[in-house]
Interface confidence: low
């Protein structure tokens, strides 16, 4: 239990050093002055404290800073960062990328995705926007962390920064995040030639609308199946068989492998079977020949 007791005179702490590893939890609680700890935080990480002892040190800092730690303390948390909860981190105001780098390094190899996501969020809030330096730091020290940001936070990315984002940084992004990033990427890469443009825009295509996917089908891009499978279902469903064939080029035969998976499965169900047959892939499940297709949504709108 962490309780407040009186510090024995011989145990009084005048500096944070290795002698503290021999202190019991109660002695640390009683003898370590929180202000001294905060002033000498840079020493803590070099001392092999137990997790129990780190708990006490955390309580000390929480006591001193009930509204959240100052950045001078946060920067030197070291392994004490592993003790922080998202609720703790939410109280911080972080503006320094050196602080971000230091804590990202500490978190490596630990299950701290929620804490890291909250930390990155606080950095974006502290700096006012997701600028190029922040994106560079994230891509260098935490691949995939960009996708831990909410769509609202990602909306603060200026298009000029998009070029610093690598394909692997977007691997874990969901549709709502790509919906935000795709228009920025389109703007960022708009002056590039067709083939160069496709290479750059490809990782962001999970946020592309139907009309942009249709446009790509006219440009001999030979989209790979992995990218096609990440397209929004709503963007794929209106495509014709001819458009998909043009879009995928030689990769079209991959549709057979993905026949049972969305969005391919859903797209097949909306195509005429005789159109699907023209692909020569044996895709089944299209609308049988001779059937009349009624668009009920239109009929309902008219009635």
């Amino acid at each position: 239990d962490v309780e407040r007791t009186t510090c024995p005179p011989e145990k009084e702490v005048h500096e944070i050093d290795e002698s503290l590893i021999f202190y019991k939890k109660r002695e640390l609680e009683a003898c370590v002055d929180a202000a001294l700890l905060a002033a000498q935080m840079d020493r803590v990480d070099a001392i092999p404290f137990t997790y129990e002892q780190l708990d006490v040190l955390k309580h000390k800092l929480d006591e001193l800073y009930p509204q959240g730690y100052p950045e001078s303390v946060i920067r030197h948390l070291g392994h004490l960062f592993l003790k922080m909860s998202p609720e703790d981190i939410r109280k911080w105001n972080v503006t320094s990328l050196e602080t971000l780098k230091a804590l990202l390094k500490v978190s490596k190899g630990h299950e701290m995705s929620a804490q890291v996501a909250t930390l990155i969020d606080r950095v974006v809030v502290g700096r006012g926007q997701l600028d190029k330096d922040t994106v560079d730091t994230l891509t260098a020290f935490c691949p995939g962390c960009l996708c831990s940001l909410s769509p609202e936070r990602l909306s603060s990315v200026p298009p000029s920064v998009i070029g610093a984002v690598r394909p692997q940084d977007l691997d874990t992004c969901g549709p709502r995040q790509l919906d935000v990033l795709y228009p920025k990427a389109r703007l960022a890469f708009q002056n590039m030639s067709g083939s160069e443009y496709f290479v750059k825009i490809r990782p962001f295509l999970g946020g592309a609308p139907t009309e942009d996917v249709k446009a790509l089908s006219q440009q001999n891009v030979s989209m790979d199946l992995a990218t096609f499978m990440k397209l929004r279902r709503e963007a794929v469903l209106p495509l014709t068989v001819a458009e998909v064939q043009k879009l995928l080029g030689p990769h079209v035969e991959g549709l057979k492998v993905e026949e049972q998976h969305s969005p391919v499965r859903d797209w097949i169900l909306k195509q005429r079977q005789d159109d699907l047959d023209t692909l020569g892939l044996g895709l089944q499940g299209g609308i049988p020949n001779g059937y009349l297709i009624l668009d009920l949504s239109v009929r309902e709108a008219l009635s």
Partner: antibody, heavy 120, light 107 residues
């Protein structure tokens, strides 16, 4: 020692407002958030909201947003809660409570409580 | 809002016995739970925070524990002054919420 002193009772008429006070002593007033909690007989405890005495920032329970206004006077180390448009539902004991010592939102010191009776 | 359920409104025990007061959170709150004791006619008093840390000055017969979203306050060697109502409270997220309370009666 740490104390939160509140007046014992307040008798108010329906529709009126009342401003409850909570005088803190024995600690640095601006270093700890102050919360307010309502207790009606047989109905447990309800968190109303909290205020950061160092900058006046508040968080309110949605259920009390239009009912309670929290303020502080740092010169006298006093927290206030104004309750408006009072009805019989507002008859209760109101406690001011100090935030836990290590920064989480639990309550380590409770005030003496003010019994508010709304009656014509 | 997170609902904290104390299913037993009343519990009866004898001096010297061991009794457990339980509280269940409607969703994950980690260890962000506190326990309070309210003796008749008094203000509540802090007993436990962070699910299992005893507050300064609280007798060690009071212990807190957690298993998932189930929180338990155990009083071993119950004393007559333990006659009181006990409340749990979550401080994991706003709004902060309390359990409905469990009244401990001494036979």
């Amino acid at each position: 020692q740490v104390q939160l002193q509140q007046p014992g009772t307040e008798l108010v008429k329906p529709g009126a407002s009342v401003k409850l006070s909570c005088k803190a002593s024995g600690y640095t007033f601006t270093s700890y958030w102050m919360h307010w909690v309502k207790q009606r007989p047989g109905q447990g405890l309800e968190w109303i909201g909290n205020i950061n005495p160092s900058n006046g920032g508040t968080n309110n329970n949605e259920n009390f947003k239009s009912k309670a206004t929290l303020t502080v006077d740092t010169s006298s180390s006093t927290a206030y809660m104004q309750l408006s448009s009072l009805t019989s539902e507002d008859s209760a004991v109101y406690y001011c409570v100090r935030n836990g010592y290590h920064g989480y939102w639990y309550f380590d010191v409770w005030g003496t409580g003010t019994t508010v009776t709304v009656s014509s | 809002d997170i609902v904290m359920t104390q299913s037993q409104k009343f519990m009866s025990t004898s001096v010297g016995d061991r009794v457990s007061v339980t509280c269940k959170a409607s969703q994950n709150v980690g260890t962000n739970v506190a326990w309070y004791q309210q003796q008749p006619g008094q203000s509540p008093k802090a007993l436990i925070y962070s699910a299992s840390y005893r507050y300064s000055g609280v007798p060690d017969r009071f212990t807190g524990s957690v298993s998932g979203t189930d929180f338990t306050l155990t009083i071993s060697n119950v004393q007559s002054e333990d006659l009181a109502e006990y409340f749990c409270q979550q401080y994991n997220s706003y709004p902060l919420t309390f359990g409905g309370g469990t009244k401990l009666e001494i036979k």
